[in-house]
């Protein structure tokens, strides 16, 4: 059956921790991605942003988990209105910002 949202969120948090712990070297060779609004629909927005990073094995599992959390199909080059498409940030910063927000959601019990 489908993975419960709380389990998927925990899995995503744990994976984001895995790829950032004690990491000082630029993630994905310093690739830049669009910043997103950390609001409703952020899983799809995060995936839309990260899916445009290619050849970075460190975030493959993150992309897979986000695919499971986003209810619609996402492909490279696709952008929703949820993007703040005026700001690009490094993947490492994107991941850390996302991680801190997800932990806040988890503590508040907002799993969807």
């Amino acid at each position: 059956g489908p993975v419960p949202p709380s389990t998927a969120l925990r899995e995503l948090i744990e994976e984001l921790v895995n790829i950032t712990q004690n990491q000082k070297a630029p993630l994905c060779n310093g690739s830049m991605v669009w910043s997103i609004n950390l609001t409703a629909g952020m899983y799809c927005a995060a995936l839309e942003s990260l899916i445009n990073v290619s050849g970075c094995s460190a975030i493959y599992r993150t992309q897979r988990i986000l695919h499971g959390l986003c209810p619609h199909k996402v492909s490279a080059g696709q952008f929703s209105s949820l993007h703040v498409r005026d700001t690009k940030i490094e993947v490492a910063q994107f991941v850390k910002d996302l991680l801190l927000h997800l932990k806040k959601l988890f503590r508040e019990g907002q799993f969807n």
Partner: antibody, heavy 126, light 109 residues
Framework: EVQLVESGGGLVKPGGSLRLSCAAS????????MSWVRQAPGKGLEWVGR??????????NYAAPVKGRFTISRDDSKNTLYLQMNSLKTEDTAVYYC?????????????????WGQGTTVTVSS | SYELTQPPSVSVSPGQTARITCSGD??????AYWYQQKSGQAPVLVIY???KRPSGIPERFSGSSSGTMATLTISGAQVEDEADYYC???????????FGGGTKLTVLG
């Protein structure tokens, strides 16, 4: 006051078991990644293992010499960290410290904060 | 298993600059942390994430990192800085911690 207090050390025979405890106070223990570090008499510091906070997965990692024999756990409701040591060897004789894990500091609320216990002595001898 | 290498000892006169090095293959991508341990006491963090100084640590302590080497610098070393210093980091996975063998700093008073 921010502090960690270890207990449970003592003399044990080779092959025996011991459980160390570390009581935390003065900070949000549930957010902290925690480590055990040991120091054999007259030797340097040796990393034993760590446990992440529950929200970060609660996963554990161990140094090769203790993997499979030692188990780290935590009880956030009691603000306590544990180290279960089985199949003890004479080379496990050391002062055991519990400490906040600096690698996990970014994810908790103790960035740049450093907390160590006073250490508890474990002697493994026949 | 992953190792961090430090010189066993460093000696300076009071007021001189002491530099303690730590080398490890993963240091280009993983942060280094430095601890001071005085005899019979628990270690104290003096530098975290290569170059950040915790509150309460004197400004004479600084850290840097370049390539596979991290360096702890004590500018104007004082007699009270005499201690063992340990670098700490993780392997490339970030999952396993490791300490260097330690460096005994002697401040010749």
């Amino acid at each position: 006051e921010v502090q960690l207090v270890e207990s449970g050390g003592g003399l044990v025979k080779p092959g025996g078991s011991l459980r160390l405890s570390c009581a935390a106070s003065g900070f949000t223990f549930s957010n902290a990644w925690m480590s055990w570090v040991r120091q054999a008499p007259g030797k340097g510091l040796e990393w034993v293992g760590r446990i992440r906070s529950e929200i970060d997965g609660g996963t554990t990692n161990y140094a090769a010499p203790v993997k499979g024999r030692f188990t780290i756990s935590r009880d956030d409701s009691k603000n306590t960290l544990y180290l279960q040591m089985n199949s003890l060897k004479t080379e496990d004789t050391a002062v055991y410290y519990c400490a906040t894990d600096q690698v996990g500091a970014y994810y908790g609320d103790y960035y740049g904060m450093d907390v160590w216990g006073q250490g508890t002595t474990v002697t493994v001898s026949s | 298993s992953y190792e961090l290498t430090q010189p066993p000892s460093v000696s300076v006169s009071p007021g001189q600059t002491a530099r303690i090095t730590c080398s490890g293959d993963a240091l280009p991508e993983k942060y280094a942390y430095w601890y001071q341990q005085k005899s019979g006491q628990a270690p104290v963090l003096v530098i975290y994430e290569d170059s950040k100084r915790p509150s309460g640590i004197p400004e004479r302590f600084s850290g840097s990192s370049s390539g596979t080497m991290a360096t702890l610098t004590i500018s104007g070393a004082q007699v009270e800085d005499e201690a063992d210093y340990y670098c700490h980091s993780t392997d490339s996975s970030g999952n396993h911690g490791v300490f260097g063998g330690g460096t005994k700093l002697t401040v010749l008073g």
